[in-house]
Amino acid sequence: MKVLQEPACVSDYMSISTCEWKMGGPTNCSAELRLLYQLVFQSSETHTCVPENNGGVGCVCHLLMDDVVSMDNYTLDLWAGQQLLWKGSFKPSEHVKPRAPGNLTVHTNVSDTVLLTWSNPYPPDNYLYNDLTYAVNIWSENDPAYSRIHNVTYLKPTLRIPASTLKSGISYRARVRAWAQHYNTTWSEWSPSTKWYNSYREPFEQR
């Protein structure tokens, strides 16, 4: 049994780190493999993560952790029974992938404006809470040529779009993702998308 692509891990800077890797051939990850992790810290214990399959040769493991601080460093050992397949380390604060924003809602009852709101995925006491900026992707299934990214660089998880900039009488979808500039994170996954129908019509005198 051999590791083809070494484990690569990212932290949500809250309570979970996710490690993914590829094996040299088809593997029943949960039955054959264990990923052991231990914080380099006084009197810490070794904890075990049972991986899941992620495609034929891929494995993924969700490591349960405490809140992340910059000093944290983990040793990682990938075992197949009594055989050590790979040994490495992981510093969560240096490999952050934020959680995806949630509760994306479209409000169309505001005159002349489409208001999109979503929730910050972190509690206020988390360091990422006040560091997230967002990208909102809006597209139309009726108009495949239309797809826009709106960068939200302020803290408030809202975006206002003049309804007049969207075509009337067709449906749109929106999704949002996040990143934290000061933590040099990757982008989060996209939130689930939300669909709405743009019924806005320009006033008669502006036509």
Partner: antibody, heavy 125, light 112 residues
Framework: EVQLVESGGGLEQPGGSLRLSCAGS????????MTWVRQAPGKGLEWVSS????????YYADSVKGRFTISRDNSKNTLYLQMNSLRAEDTAVYYC??????????????????WGQGTTVTVSS | DIVMTQSPLSLPVTPGEPASISCRSS???????????VDWYLQKSGQSPQLLIY???KRASGVPDRFSGSGSGTDFTLKISRVEAEDVGFYYC?????????FGQGTKLEIK
Amino acid sequence: EVQLVESGGGLEQPGGSLRLSCAGSGFTFRDFAMTWVRQAPGKGLEWVSSISGSGSSTYYADSVKGRFTISRDNSKNTLYLQMNSLRAEDTAVYYCAKDRLSITVRPRYYGLDVWGQGTTVTVSS
Amino acid sequence: DIVMTQSPLSLPVTPGEPASISCRSSQSLLYSIGYNYVDWYLQKSGQSPQLLIYLGNKRASGVPDRFSGSGSGTDFTLKISRVEAEDVGFYYCMQALTTPYTFGQGTKLEIK
């Protein structure tokens, strides 16, 4: 009531051996790291050894490394310190103390919040 | 090893007056914000040490509020707002960031 009771001290000749015990009660013993601290007559406190809750990680002062062995039996809620090749400078009162909660991924520290009454070890010919 | 240096080594105090003991470490004991791995212990004559303050400024259960800990990084202070006769004994700071745990030399607090 959370309590630690040491035993096993006594008079031993240089080169001899002693085994100290520390019985814990009133808390979930296996969840906590444990520590031994000693105090030579008229001197300050000196850390000797620590062990994680499961016993998988052990730590020693340079002055006792290779001679002392810390261990625990969680089924008996008991901590041990096996002392071999004793020297005159090992003469001290030995205290066991409850250390950090080590079952969490990052052990939670509340200080050495419970100490035993101490057991006296005298090494002399 | 981390060296812990206490001062003063002897502290005569009048009852009701404040007292302050300093402890300096040879390297930072700050692991993360608010978590300085330094403790303060009191050992009364003929007794086992007892925990007063942990993680730099957290008062242990049952410790009177006249005891307080402060400081961060390498400089720490134990303050007693109004010394009482029962506070006499040796006070030790200890770093618990990593083994070997190390203690200060001890400060003998006595009543004038």
